[in-house]
Amino acid sequence: EPPTACREKQYLINSQCCSLCQPGQKLVSDCTEFTETECLPCGESEFLDTWNRETHCHQHKYCDPNLGLRVQQKGTSETDTICTCEEGWHCTSEACESCVLHRSCSPGFGVKQIATGVSDTICEPCPVGFFSNVSSAFEKCHPWTSCETKDLVVQQAGTNKTDVVCGPQDRLR
């Protein structure tokens, strides 16, 4: 990469290397040969997260409850606010600017991974020996009932949506 005229955490202005403002502060005036860079702390609800020469701080993100958002982590002068979604909802993007309802897994499918504030429900088809008879965002595929352990026999085979039906053993010889 090309040579730079200044140290790290400095910038070049009018053939002069000036100190950048530290995170949480904005630039008021550039340094001169006699004076240092003048910086001021960001105001309430503002932030700057890098060494910078910005003359204005950035506004903290607003977590709009009308979009299903709530504050996960309050912003500081050096960090932005982090939003997440209300219970039962998840972010539509990494920036978490809006929320959508968690998806439910249809009958025949079970929950492989429960949704979080940032990821949707992951469903998987119930394999042979398992079933799900509900539409749910939490329920996994359940194993078919084992008739044998109850000293019963299978009267109706199970499917991916229904459990087996057990019945008494036929005593007629």
Epitope: T4, A5, R7, S15, Q16, S19, E33, E36
Partner: antibody, heavy 126, light 107 residues
Framework: QVQLVQSGAEVKKPGASVKVSCKAS????????MHWVRQAPGQGLEWMGW????????NYAQKFQGRVTMTRDTSISTAYMELNRLRSDDTAVYYC???????????????????WGQGTLVTVSS | DIQMTQSPSSVSASVGDRVTITCRAT??????LAWYQQRPGKAPQLLIY???TLQSGVPSRFSGSGSGTDFTLTISNLQPEDFATYYC?????????FGQGTRLEIK
Amino acid sequence: QVQLVQSGAEVKKPGASVKVSCKASGYTFTGYYMHWVRQAPGQGLEWMGWINPDSGGTNYAQKFQGRVTMTRDTSISTAYMELNRLRSDDTAVYYCARDQPLGYCTNGVCSYFDYWGQGTLVTVSS
Amino acid sequence: DIQMTQSPSSVSASVGDRVTITCRATQDIRPWLAWYQQRPGKAPQLLIYRTSTLQSGVPSRFSGSGSGTDFTLTISNLQPEDFATYYCQHAKIFPITFGQGTRLEIK
């Protein structure tokens, strides 16, 4: 007390590479930029570039761009300077030199060298 | 790049004399100037930085002054150990450059 101890003299053929080391002691290695300065026989001082041992960031003089690499190993407080594609006019004594403390400088680069290594003579000859 | 020109390139003097070496920059570098002393076969040694600040341990017979583009190093009451080569160096922006050196010899 602060000490910068460099590796021994090297004789290299044109086109080869050389890697000089500079072991620091007596101060916090990551708190000061390390510079490399060379001096050809009977000539003046020529600045080659710096490394920030804390971040690993580097800055090389245009003349050496693409031919020099400065690295460091903070676990052993050692800085390295590697010069590739050596030519006969690279024959010189190579010095590492410690800069002012990080954060000391406010409106200049303020690179004054208060401690120097003993120098490493690199001879490039066929 | 900022060029540094020293004068004279060599000077002869006697023990007890006062000697002045000058350094001129191609642009305003105040106050970012340093002076070094280098004895034969040795590494340079920082004498003065920021134009006039004496480095710790350096005798007070060494002094620096100047502003803008013109700077001077003055050695008063020369001692035998002062006969060496002296370099100026700017520290305003990178790349750093040194003067070509001034050799101080015994008359």
